[in-house]
């Protein structure tokens, strides 16, 4: 079995000749790719096109968020006859073309993943030279970034009536469950605020009233791990302030 450029084999009538039928533009991307924060991920993208064995100038583009209008995170250009796609844009230097664009492969490698990279990505190819044509994936590939919990902020704040409250904010994917422990608390899930708009991986838990001096510990946990951080409350007798 011999594969033609579109992975099909056609026998011409009464002959042994395999022909490559006229192609249409198409792009093949998986719906989702998952990887852990700190690791690298590969966003696969292959395409077919109607221009047979095009070897003219070519530009490969990846954008984030939305097709056609989203910000570009990667762009490279290959000269006529060249497999070498010279990078013109790589956001934070973390994106590089892994596929061979001359073999219709625009797969992209993303290094040092962060939770902020969790979004949809769209590949695009542009032909120049004798042929002027372009095509972009409409549905894109969702990059799902998972991460063990990390406590990004823990603090004690004054509240009305000379009282104090504690706040703990953590990030992770899946979003971590938060629990407080401390003097006279045992283990308390406390009041957990749902993830904030635009900050889907951040979760905040509040201890509304700290009644005892001592050490208060916030623990964040999800299926990938756990993290904890502590604050200390020491109130000066006869004063309305506190040392934390």
């Amino acid at each position: 079995f011999v594969r033609t450029k579109i992975d099909t084999t056609e026998n011409l009538l009464n002959t042994e000749v395999h022909s490559s039928p006229a192609q249409r533009w198409s792009m093949q991307v998986p719906p989702e790719v998952s990887a852990e924060a700190g690791d690298a991920a590969v966003l696969p993208c292959t395409f077919t096109h109607p221009h047979r064995h095009y070897d003219g100038p070519l530009t490969a583009i990846w954008r984030a968020g939305e097709p056609y209008a989203g910000p570009q995170v990667f762009r490279c250009a290959a000269a006529r006859g060249s497999e070498l796609c010279q990078t013109a844009l790589s956001l934070h230097g973390r994106f590089r073309l892994l596929g061979n664009p001359r073999r219709n492969d625009l797969s992209l490698r993303v290094e040092r993943l962060a939770l902020a990279d969790d979004r949809r990505y769209f590949c695009r190819v542009e032909f120049a030279g004798d042929v002027h044509d372009r095509y972009e994936s409409r549905h894109g590939v969702r990059l799902h970034v998972t991460a063990a919990p990390r406590i990004v902020n823990i603090s004690v704040l004054p509240s009305p009536a000379h009282a104090f409250r504690a706040l703990c904010t953590a990030e992770g994917e899946p979003p971590p469950a938060l629990a407080w422990s401390g003097p006279a608390l045992g283990n308390s899930l406390a009041a957990v605020r749902s993830p904030r708009e635009g900050h889907g991986h951040l979760v905040t838990a509040e201890l509304p009233a700290l009644t005892h001096d001592g050490r208060y510990t916030c623990t964040a946990a999800n299926s990938l791990g756990r993290s904890e951080a502590s604050v200390y409350l020491f109130r000066f007798h006869g004063a309305s302030g506190a040392s934390t």
């Epitope: 033609t4 000749v17 022909s19 064995h53 060249s82 001359r102 073999r103």
Partner: antibody, heavy 120, light 106 residues
């Protein structure tokens, strides 16, 4: 089955010309680039150039520009390589090659080679 | 043009031995391709896009590298691996081959 059948060995005089043929079966040459590669015992492989048989678009290694002429006849599914003003440096085996089935890498199918000997 | 320099030009290895040959490019390339040729036969595509094995190539062959430095490694040499190996670049016209590494069996 994909095959490239090349013409037989040639013994030619210095200064003469020679035209080699490569007939493809199993695919239409108009759908894929056809390449010519030169092999000499001590020099290894050299890419001469490639032709797009459908529109005649050609790319040569500058070293062979003026020396080699690539043509193709899609009606007979045959590619040709003509060498002119032959010298002893042109004594070599010449292969025609296709990028058919490039999903599995370049230069997928090679002809059996044609030995050209330039000798007085 | 991009000049590909292969080393060593000739080498020999015993069965079971690990073998590494290199291909150095005069300018940066994005991929390297490798071909195997045995005496009296046409070359065969062997490794493409630096590290992908062509159909039928045993898994003991490993291609690696980037930029200007590439290598082909055979994890455990076998008698049938004795051949000449050529690297090839398509990162700029004119496309070029290396001078080849002839691998002999001891």
């Amino acid at each position: 089955e994909v095959q490239l059948q090349q013409s037989g060995a040639e013994l030619v005089r210095p200064g003469a010309s020679v035209k080699l043929s490569c007939t493809a079966s199993g695919f239409n040459i108009k759908d894929y680039y056809m390449h010519w590669v030169k092999e000499r015992p001590e020099q290894g492989l050299e890419w001469i150039g490639r032709i797009d048989p459908e529109d005649g678009d050609i790319e040569y290694d500058p070293k062979f520009q003026g020396k080699a002429t690539m043509t193709a006849d899609t009606s007979s599914n045959t590619a040709y390589l003509q060498f002119s003003s032959l010298t002893s440096e042109d004594t070599a085996v010449y292969y025609c090659v296709t990028d058919y089935d490039y999903d599995g890498g370049w230069f997928a199918y090679w002809g059996q080679g044609t030995l050209v000997t330039v000798s007085a | 043009q991009i000049i590909l320099t292969q080393s060593p030009a000739i080498m020999s290895a015993s069965p079971g031995e690990k073998v590494t040959m290199t291909c150095s490019a005069s300018s940066s390339t994005s991929f390297m391709h490798w071909y195997q040729q045995k005496p009296g036969t046409s070359p065969k595509r062997w490794i493409f896009d630096t590290s992908k094995l062509a159909s039928g190539v045993p898994g003991r062959f490993i291609g690696s590298g980037s930029g200007t430095s590439y290598s082909l490694t055979i994890s455990t040499m076998e008698a049938e691996d004795a051949a000449t190996y050529y690297c090839h670049q398509r990162s700029a016209y004119p496309w070029t081959f290396g001078g080849g590494t002839k691998l002999e069996i001891k």
